[in-house]
Interface confidence: medium
């Protein structure tokens, strides 16, 4: 891996990749794009899934945080032989199934989808793709689209969350490498630190949550700070302010010394959460402190 910027966010990342006949001579470029991007998401809490679509959608690698499984998944991805039609909706279906199932199991982890296609979607196929992307959104996902070569940017803006969630690659497949940094910057939602990280037991505090990507939410009014206290009860708080690199949140009053609150952020009013390893602890503060 080549160092450089990385993402420390804990969420579920789905790659939905076009393997239709039109990418036959460009699969290597798609593979290397995914491989380099995948290595930049380095949180141990980040899970990844590889989905490919042509005339049907196939989950090549189910959601996993296991780095060895991801390595094997990338090997499988490299072996893919493209062919068939561009049934992008089938790819979104495979993602939604996993999001739906994970939510059902009680894992309300935030989902980010990066969908890549190289062609215009005709009539029904566009309608189905938009519909399936909407279903993924309804399940809490943030959807980004990468369009290469003969894509229709208006279509992709409707499949993705917005025009700002579309990455156009107009110079052909070899130019995919050039958007890795911007995709990483836009798709990464991460919690890096909390200030203060130690608070006084029984007192009210405001916490500054440092990170990135907090304004990537479709609606910033739906951003929440979430505190999971002693691995049991979760309290959600509405931030006083939401900026891209920090949130200002009221902290819950933790009555006892030694209590721990793990910090999470929801971008969708508590439907799903970005996890982190950031912990706020309580300490005893004397009257003078």
């Amino acid at each position: 891996e080549d160092g450089g910027p990385a993402c420390y966010g804990g969420f579920d990342l789905y790659f939905i990749l076009d393997k239709s006949g039109s990418v036959l001579h460009h699969w290597n470029e798609i593979y290397y794009f995914v491989e380099q991007l995948a290595h930049k998401f380095i949180s141990p809490q980040l899970r990844m899934s590889f989905i490919v679509f042509s005339t049907r959608g196939t989950t090549l690698m189910k959601l996993t945080e296991d780095r060895e499984q991801i390595r094997q998944g990338l090997e499988e991805l490299q072996k893919v032989l493209p062919g068939g039609d561009t049934y992008m909706h089938e790819g979104f279906e495979r993602a939604s199934e996993q999001i739906y199932y994970e939510n059902r199991q009680g894992y309300r982890t935030a989902s980010v989808i990066i969908a890549l296609t190289d062609g215009e979607l005709h009539e029904d196929l566009f309608f189905y793709s938009e519909r399936e992307a909407n279903r993924s959104r309804d399940l809490g996902a943030i959807v980004y689209c990468v369009g290469v070569k003969d894509f229709n940017e208006t279509q992709l803006a409707r499949i993705a969350d917005s025009k700002d969630h579309v990455f156009p690659v107009n110079d052909g497949f070899q130019a995919l490498q050039g958007i890795i940094h911007s995709i990483l910057k836009k798709s990464c939602i991460e919690i890096l630190a909390a200030e203060p990280s130690t608070i006084c037991a029984g007192e009210s505090f405001q916490v500054v949550v440092r990170g990135n990507g907090f304004r990537h939410a479709r609606n910033v009014d739906r951003v929440l700070c979430s505190f999971k206290i002693n691995d049991s009860v979760t309290l959600n708080e509405k931030p006083f302010s939401v900026e891209d690199t920090y949130l200002l949140c009221p902290a819950p009053i933790l009555k006892e010394v030694g209590m721990k609150a793990a910090l999470q952020v929801s971008m969708n009013d508590g439907l799903s959460f970005i996890s982190s390893s950031v912990i706020i602890t309580t300490t005893h503060c004397s009257d003078g402190s």
């Epitope: 279906e93 199934e97 739906y100 939510n103 059902r104 909407n134 309804d138």
Partner: antibody
């Protein structure tokens, strides 16, 4: 208690548009998923589609582009439009709710019978 | 789409007896299977969700089991009000589909 009530004409002519409204009380249509399900005489139940809490719609591909589901959050109502009806669309039409991250229809309207005939 | 097949189409049982209804999915739907009861002139009523999860207000004599493609609804001891049509529903994949129903009638 959540209640759903379907309303609309009981008779529609072939090739015309069937329009039904479901009024929801006891819950907000800005949460959960709001569905239309129908049952033709002697047939199994057929899920037609939903409108979600966010306003996204998802419909049964068998109905192709004939179906439209809309909502009016100010009245807490959602509606069904089915274009180019034929006698095969004669059925009891139900509106039903399912909860977010669920897929079982836990609350139903009592149903309204629609006959397609000239 | 996933095809749901119920058997038998009609089940004749005496009150107090046990009734076992089957539902088969054309592909693996894990436990995303729901059961409904429908009486003449009424809307369906949810009995069991996610194959075996009970609903508050539904009598304990109704129970569900199964996973994957084969599912069973059991009514341990039939009461007079249980004679109705029972439907299973695929909740795994769109479009959601229902079985053809099993009519439980008095023997």
């Amino acid at each position: 208690e959540v209640q759903l009530q379907e309303s609309g004409p009981g008779l529609v002519k072939p090739s015309e548009t069937l329009s039904l409204t479901c009024t929801v009380t006891g819950d907000s249509i800005s949460s959960d998923y709001w569905n239309w399900v129908r049952q033709a005489p002697g047939q199994r139940l057929e899920w037609m589609g939903y409108i979600s809490y966010s306003g996204n719609t998802y419909t049964n591909p068998s109905l192709k582009s004939r179906i439209t589901i809309n909502r009016d959050t100010s009245k807490n109502q959602f509606s069904l439009q089915l274009n180019s009806v034929t006698p095969e669309d004669t059925a009891v039409y139900y509106c039903a709710r399912y909860k977010t991250i669920d897929s079982s229809f836990d609350v139903w309207g009592q149903g309204t019978t629609v006959t397609v005939s000239s | 789409e996933i095809v749901m097949t119920q058997s038998p189409a009609t089940l004749s049982v005496s009150p107090g007896e046990r009734a076992t209804l089957s539902c088969r999915a054309s592909q693996n739907i894990r436990d995303f299977l729901h059961w409904y009861q429908q009486k003449p002139g009424q809307a369906p009523r949810l009995l069991i969700y996610y194959a075996s999860q009970s609903i508050s207000g539904i009598p304990a004599r109704f129970s569900g089991s199964g996973s994957g493609t084969d599912f069973t609804l059991t009514i341990s001891s039939l009461e007079p009000e249980d004679f109705a049509v029972y439907y299973c529903q695929n909740g795994h994949s769109f479009p959601y589909t229902f079985g053809g129903g099993t009519k439980v009638e008095i023997k």
